[in-house]
Structure formats: C-alpha cells, structure tokens
Interface confidence: low
Amino acid sequence: QPSVSPGEPSPPSIHPGKSDLIVRVGDEIRLLCTDPGFVKWTFEILDETNENKQNEWITEKAEATNTGKYTCTNKHGLSNSIYVFVRDPAKLFLVDRSLYGKEDNDTLVRCPLTDPEVTNYSLKGCQGKPLPKDLRFIPDPKAGIMIKSVKRAYHRLCLHCSVDQEGKSVLSEKFILKVRPAFKAVPVVSVSKASYLLREGEEFTVTCTIKDVSSSVYSTWKRENSQTKLQEKYNSWHHGDFNYERQATLTISSARVNDSGVFMCYANNTFGSANVTTTLEVVDKGFINIFPMINTTVFVNDGENVDLIVEYEAFPKPEHQQWIYMNRTFTDKWEDYPKSENESNIRYVSELHLTRLKGTEGGTYTFLVSNSDVNAAIAFNVYVNTKPEILTYDRLVNGMLQCVAAGFPEPTIDWYFCPGTEQRCSASVLPVDVQTLNSSGPPFGKLVVQSSIDSSAFKHNGTVECKAYNDVGKTSAYFNFAFKGNNKEQIHPHTLFTP
C-alpha cells in the first residue's frame, strides 16, 4: 500500500492490497477503493472500457471476460490499479483478432490470459506450420504476445497464441497478421505523355501513374508557378501485396491558349517525394512548317537520279500531300511517312524520287501539303545538266562559218584551225560574233549559243573545228576546205562527238 506523506496528495488505496488477484469463474469479485477524494473505478481489457462511480466494485459471478485491469482514480488524478485474472479452464485466452503490424515496428498479438499460472505461453503457426525462423516475440500474460520488428515477409501469416495446460497444448483462435509496409523509396511516378499539342477547344487529358508499396502514398497534380487546385480523378489498384498503383487523371475539357504550360504530377510518402512533368501547348490554329532537306535549287546530270526531300511539321495531322510538275500531279515515285513512331510526332518526311532525268525534265517541282487548318508549299528548281549538242554548222553566204550549240549549263563555243592534214587543231580562232539565243523550250531547258567566224581569214588548206563544251561534256564539228588557185573549194562540214 502507498505510504501517506502529509501535505501532499496520495494515490487511493485498494483492497485487497495486491497487484494481481486470481479468482475462479463464478466467484465474486469485490474491490474496495479508499480515498477521501474518490472519483471512479475504471475497467480495461483489450479495447473494452467500463466505469463505476461506486467506491466498491462488485461482480457477483465473475466470468473470463471480467479479466483485466481495474483502476481507481481520485480527484487529484492520482490512481492505483489491480489486475484480476478470472480463471476459466474453458476460456484461457481473451482475444482481439485484428492484427496489424507496421514493417520494422513491434506489434501486439492481443491474447491476454485468464490464468497466469499456465505455462509455455507462446505463438504457434496455423496447421502445425513453423513460424518464420527470424520471428521474435515476447509474451505478457496481461497484454498478449509482442512480435518484435515485423518483416514484410510476415504479411498474411496465420498465428495462434498457445499455452500448456495440464500437459496439453491449448491454442487460441487464429490471427492473420497484416503488415503495413514501410516506405523505403520514393514513389514511382510516370506520365502518359511528356508533351501535348492541342488546338483551342480540344480536351486535354493526361494520366499520371503513381506506384508505391501502399495506398497511403499522397499524390496530386499541380500547375507550375500556380496554387490553383486542379481537378483530377483517381483509379487505383493493388497488384498483389505491396504493389499499389494509382492513376490520377487531369482533364481540361476545353483547353485555351492560356492553359499552355507545365503540369507536374507530385507524389510523396514518408521516405520522400517524386515528380514528373508534362508540357501542354495550346495553339489557336494549326500549322505547317516545311524544311527542305536539300537545296531548293538542284542541278543534276542528264540521265541521273535525284531525290527531292522535305521534312515538315504539321499539326493537326496532314490530310493531303502531293508533288506537282508542269501542272501534272505525280501518282507514284514519291513517299510520305512520319519522322517518328512516337504518338506525339508532328514531323513528317516526303520524298520524290526522280529517275534518269532527261534534259527536257528540268523545271519547278512543287510539294504541297495541307491539313484541316492550313496549306503550305515548297518549290524545287531542278536544272538538268546536258552535254552540248551542235544544232547547226554552216558556211553562210557572206563567208562566215556559223556554229549553233545547245546545252545546260550554257555551252561555250571555241574555234580552232588545223592547217593541212594535221589532226590536232591547236591554233584558236577568235569569233566575230557570239550570241545567246532564246530557247523555245521550257525556262529550265537547254541554253542555245550561236558563234561565227570569218573564213576569209584562212590562207591555207585545213580544217576548222567548232568545239562546244560545258561542265558536262564537249562536242565538236569540223569544216574541211582546200585552196585551188586563189579560190576556196567547197567546205565539207562533219561532226565528231567527244565524250
């Protein structure tokens, strides 16, 4: 019993004056609390609590469920307790079967005893299964059995409290341990798409997936540099133990240009936080931007191939693409494909494959593309380089020798004189007249050049060479003539093509 020191409040005294009392089922429990400032008796066992304002607690016929802690409290808030065991051979355990344990913490299997004198109070696995090797526990007849440092592996473990009574093992009802995992990493967050491009009025919807070990992970969508609460909807699943997934979907039913910006999906748990962002760009109108992948002025040799390639950005998706030449639309020889397989791709490639181009096929090749909002076009000017061709080579009535050649780029005509029977015409002759003539063909066709020399300048037998050349090649025509007396004989022109 507590001793009384004058001038200082003391706890109440209880009769019988011992800390534990054992009674048999059916017997009377009589507890007396003595204190001038008596307030109440309180009874506690498991989650049950009862109060009594009488200073004497009397239970006429004790039951196993009357086992528990009886506390007397006075007006100073001081108290004294006695623990009563009501021994019932038919009910050795009082149980609260709810059993939750937080990972790495201790948890109590609540199976207090009604008889403190039984032996071997411990835990056993259900159906004779052994407990996990690393499971440690501490029995306390008044409270239950404390499992130390709960592991994630104990989740869904089936247990009994066990005692030995008169040489036999007696088991309580079964307990199923549910382990609440500790957060040992930040949540894993991901977003359905990293960027969105929309037109005004379209719906913006983005889903953030949050993965963690339990549903107590917190998550929210935030707009960067804004405190406005965003409207989001959740779906969640448990994909087995400690594998929880939540989908937080943010929706703006009719996006506006000023909704553009960065949206962050933020998640945190007791370990830390994680976030992922998505970018929304809202445009008031679609667009098409074309980027030529080769120079828009193209020079190609006669008979060779060329690929006209453009890349273009189109939003919304392109609906019509075509390549046009001389008001004629190509039905084949071209392909159009997305630059990337990414769902958010807006970049495309179009290629026109021109094969074995002829000198007559130079000109403007146009790529046109349109979507529901805009049209765009780009033109390529294709010049076909052709070796000069000598169109005419004549002696005119005025004694001039004239050579007319066509090709692209514009041919240059040089004249040479070969005296006698020499094969090499090395002495150059200056023309008296050079003109670039207008071609009757298309603007990208061959250029025609006319050059003339005065044959009266020649005093010896020989050959005159008219040589037309450009970057692609050269072609020659020859005028043979001889002197008879003081007169020139007939001039015989012939050509020799030099590759």
Partner: antibody, heavy 123, light 107 residues
Framework: QVQLVQSGAEVKKPGESLKISCKGS????????IAWVRQMPGKGLEWMGI????????LYSPSFQGQVTISADKSISTAYLQWSSLKASDTAMYYC????????????????WGQGTLVTVSS | DIELTQPPSVSVSPGQTASITCSGD??????ASWYQQKPGQAPVLVIY???KRPSGIPERFSGSNSGNTATLTISGTQAEDEADYYC??????????FGGGTKLTVL
C-alpha cells in the same frame, strides 16, 4: 548472317586525309540506317551521325558537323566516314552500326556493329 | 541535345540484382537502348525500345524507362556480365546520344 566489316587500322599524320569503310552483308543494305560511333582511348561512345544508304540522307551530331563526311555507295553495300584534314584529337576507334529491322531513325538501337577501325593520328 | 548521366561504376555480388540508371531530361518520353561492351570488343545491344530484348540476350537483362530515368536491371548477375554499359536515346532533332557509361563490377 548480318555482318558489318570495317576497313583496317590506319596510322596517319596530322593534316592528311582519310576515308574508312564499312561493308554490310547478309541483309538489304539500302533499307537500314548505318551510324558511325567514335570511342576515344579509355572513353565512352559518341554518336557522330547516321546515313540512309538508299538515298544517302545523312544526319550529323552537332559536334561532328563539318568535321567529317558520311557517305555510302549502295551499289557495293558500303558506308564511308572521311576526314579531309586529320587532327591528333581524331585518334580513336571508330565503329559503324546498323539500326535493327523494324526500327526507325526515331528510336535507334544498333543491333549489329562492325569490329571497329582504329585510327591513329600522330606526327 | 539531351545529356545522359550514368553512375561511373556499380558493384554487385554474383547472383544479386544490379541496377544501372541513366538520367536525362524527360527521357521517359522517348525510347532508350542499352549496350554492353567488354574490353577490346565492339558494343552489343542488350535492350532496345526501353524494355525489349534482342534474340540471344539472356532473360536476366531487363529495362525500363519513365520520367527522367531509364534503368537497366540485371537479375541474378553472373561474372560474365562484368563490362561497361551504355544507355542511348534520340532527341526530337533525331540526334542520338550515349550516356557516359557505367563500369559493372561483379565482386
């Protein structure tokens, strides 16, 4: 089987030109991108550029643009990497690699690699 | 251009799981691939399109890619897995880039 065979090791002086090759076999050479990758001694991999042999469409890493030329001759299933004027800092192992079937330039994953060509530039 | 950051080295005991990360701005929005390179050899593709395994690559190699991090996971690591590992992605301009490489040591 798919093979990329590269030309042999080269020892050059600074200022010299060089063209190394990568010959593909066992697949349709024109329909797959070929990339060139540099690995300087004791360092990591660096993507230099890529070519589509069908039409010689090339893309260069900004770090290598203007420093090298990537080309291809589809008639002999060969891709080339060339320098007009070598520097000592061009000393490295150079690999060619192919984008796998079903891949595209957007998601390059190089499933077949050449054995590498070691280029040493020293005065 | 995207910059990819890898840890210079990772150590693992035989039979344990090795994780090699590759971080870069928003790389989860594009596909990542992973290469293994042993000394004196050309690189070998082990993962492409984030998590696909080429034929001939053991099932213990797996990949993931979300947010700013791509991860190569080798479960039940074996001594023969000791090598340099490189991640790679391609940006919107179609330029590829490799990570700096991670040396995996099997203890």
């Amino acid at each position: 089987q798919v093979q990329l065979v590269q030309s042999g090791a080269e020892v050059k002086k600074p200022g010299e030109s060089l063209k190394i090759s990568c010959k593909g076999s066992g697949y349709s050479f024109t329909n797959y991108w070929i990339a060139w990758v540099r690995q300087m001694p004791g360092k990591g991999l660096e993507w230099m550029g890529i070519i589509y042999p069908s039409n010689s469409y090339t893309l260069y890493s900004p770090s290598f643009q203007g420093q090298v030329t990537i080309s291809a001759d589809k008639s002999i299933s060969t891709a080339y990497l060339q320098w007009s004027s070598l520097k000592a800092s061009d000393t490295a192992m150079y690999y060619c690699a192919r984008v796998p079937p079903g891949g595209s330039i957007s998601y390059p994953a190089f499933d077949h690699w050449g054995q590498g060509t070691l280029v040493t530039v020293s005065s | 251009d995207i910059e990819l950051t890898q840890p210079p080295s990772v150590s693992v005991s035989p039979g344990q799981t090795a994780s090699i990360t590759c971080s870069g701005d928003n790389i989860g929005s594009i596909y990542a691939s992973w290469y293994q390179q042993k000394p004196g050899q050309a690189p070998v593709l082990v993962i492409y399109r984030d998590n696909k395994r080429p034929s001939g690559i053991p099932e213990r190699f797996s990949g993931s890619n979300s947010g700013n991090t791509a991860t190569l996971t080798i479960s039940g690591t074996q001594a023969e897995d000791e090598a340099d590992y490189y991640c790679s992605v391609t940006d919107m301009e179609q330029h590829s880039v490799f990570g700096g490489g991670t040396k995996l040591t099997v203890l």
